[in-house]
C-alpha cells in the first residue's frame, strides 16, 4: 500500500480466483483513543471499532472510502484504490491501446520543434468518474525537471456503438537546450483513476524522435509564362525552431489529381520553392520533415491548381 495523495491510498493487488488478498491496517487520524467506529462509503454498517481497522482487500468491493467516527462526528477518511495485477501484468483497462507505432501504445506524444515543449494524448471509452495526473522528467535516476499542465478532454469521437474520448496534456522541459544532443530520454508518467481503479501508464522518448513539424505556411502558386508549369513557394511554419539555417527542414511537393487513383507526382527539395506541372483539377500539396533526422512528416498544406 502507498499514498497517492493526502488520504488516498493505492493497494497493489495480485489478483486470481481465491487469492488471499492484501492485509491493510487503517489508522484513524485523531488523538482520540476510545469510542471510535469505522464505516465504508455511505453505509452505516459498523465494520470495526478502535483506532485501527484491519481489513483483507481481495477485490474492488473492499475498496472505497473508509471513515472513522466518534459519537456521530467524522474524525478522518481514507480512500482505498486498487491497482490490480493479473497473471503478472498490471491492468490497462482505462486507456485504449492506440496500436501505433506498436502494440501496447497507450500514450502518444509529439513536439512541433526542439524547444522542449511537447504534447501527449491518450484515448478512453470511459466518460465519467475519471481523473488523470501527469508527471514528467528527463531521465529517471537523477531526474531533470519537466512541467506538465492539467490533462484536458480534447476531442470526442463516435466509433461504432462506442464513444471515444481523447485527453491531452502539454509539457515543457524546464531548462531545454534545443541544439544539444539528447542523451537521456524524457519520461512521462500518467496516473489514471476510474472509480476505485488505479492504473499508471508511462512513455519514454527523445524529443528528436517525436518531432512533427507544423505544415508549411503561405503556400502560393505563380504560373510561369507560356508554360503548364507553376512555381510553388512556401515558408517554414511559425512554430519551427530557429535559426532555420541550423534547424533546417526538407520538403515533399506532391501534385495529386482529383481522383485518388491518378498517379501522384512527387518532388523532394530542401528549398522553399519548386517548379511543377499543374494539371487541370489537380491540387498541389507540400509537407515538411526535419532535414537531418528522419522523424515524422508534417501534415500536408494544399492549394488547388486552378
Amino acid at each position: 500500500i502507498w499514498e497517492l495523495k493526502k488520504d488516498v491510498y493505492v493497494v497493489e493487488l495480485d489478483w486470481y480466483p481465491d487469492a488471499p488478498g492484501e492485509m491493510v491496517v487503517l489508522t484513524c487520524d485523531t488523538p482520540e483513543e476510545d469510542g471510535i467506529t469505522w464505516t465504508l462509503d455511505q453505509s452505516s454498517e459498523v465494520l470495526g471499532s478502535g483506532k485501527t481497522l484491519t481489513i483483507q482487500v481481495k477485490e474492488f468491493g473492499d475498496a472505497g472510502q473508509y471513515t472513522c467516527h466518534k459519537g456521530g462526528e467524522v474524525l478522518s477518511h481514507s480512500l482505498l484504490l486498487l491497482h490490480k495485477k493479473e497473471d503478472g501484468i498490471w491492468s490497462t483497462d482505462i486507456l485504449k491501446d492506440q496500436k501505433e507505432p506498436k502494440n501496447k501504445t497507450f500514450l502518444r506524444c509529439e513536439a512541433k520543434n526542439y524547444s522542449g515543449r511537447f504534447t501527449c494524448w491518450w484515448l478512453t471509452t470511459i466518460s465519467t468518474d475519471l481523473t488523470f495526473s501527469v508527471k514528467s522528467s528527463r531521465g529517471s535516476s537523477d531526474p531533470q525537471g519537466v512541467t506538465c499542465g492539467a490533462a484536458t478532454l480534447s476531442a470526442e469521437r463516435v466509433r461504432g456503438d462506442n464513444k471515444e474520448y481523447e485527453y491531452s496534456v502539454e509539457c515543457q522541459e524546464d531548462s531545454a537546450c534545443p541544439a544539444a544532443e539528447e542523451s537521456l530520454p524524457i519520461e512521462v508518467m500518467v496516473d489514471a483513476v476510474h472509480k476505485l481503479k488505479y492504473e499508471n501508464y508511462t512513455s519514454s522518448f527523445f524529443i528528436r524522435d517525436i518531432i512533427k513539424p507544423d505544415p508549411p505556411k503561405n503556400l502560393q502558386l505563380k504560373p510561369l509564362k507560356n508554360s503548364r508549369q507553376v512555381e510553388v513557394s512556401w515558408e517554414y511554419p511559425d512554430t519551427w525552431s530557429t535559426p532555420h539555417s541550423y534547424f533546417s527542414l526538407t520538403f515533399c511537393v506532391q501534385v495529386q489529381g482529383k481522383s485518388k487513383r491518378e498517379k501522384k507526382d512527387r518532388v523532394f527539395t530542401d528549398k522553399t520553392s519548386a517548379t511543377v506541372i499543374c494539371r487541370k483539377n489537380a491540387s498541389i500539396s507540400v509537407r515538411a520533415q526535419d532535414r537531418y533526422y528522419s522523424s515524422s512528416w508534417s501534415e500536408w498544406a494544399s492549394v488547388p491548381c486552378s
Epitope: D41, F60, G61, D93, D161, N162, K195, L196, K197
Partner: nanobody, 123 residues
Amino acid sequence: EVQLVESGGGVVQAGESLRLSCAASGRSFSNYEMGWFRQAPGTEREFVGTISRRGSSTYYADSVKGRFTISRDNAKNTVYLQMSSLKPEDTAVYYCAAGQLFPSSHSRDYDYWGQGTQVTVSS
C-alpha cells in the same frame, strides 16, 4: 446507456439445473464487466458472481462456487449464468448487472441493472 434483459427463470426441483441469459443492448457490451446478483424476499441483494469484459476471468460468491458458472458471448452481447445442483436456498430474483470494475461483489460498482428473473427451487 446499457439496457439489460434477463430470461430463463422458472420453477425447478432441487438438484436440477437452469441457465439464465442476460441480453445487453446500447453501448458496447465488451467494455463492461458483467455480474449476477440475487435477492430473496425480505433479504438484501446478494452477489452471485462476475465475469471480466473479455471473459477470461470469473469470480464467485462462496455460496455458489463449484455449482454456478458464468460465461459470456461478446459477439451476441449476452452473458449466461449456468446453475446446477440447485438448492431451495437458491430461490430468488436473479439480476444481471454491468460495471467497469472487476472483480467486485459490491452492488455500488455496477452502473446498469436488469429487471430480474425469478428462480424458484422446490424441494
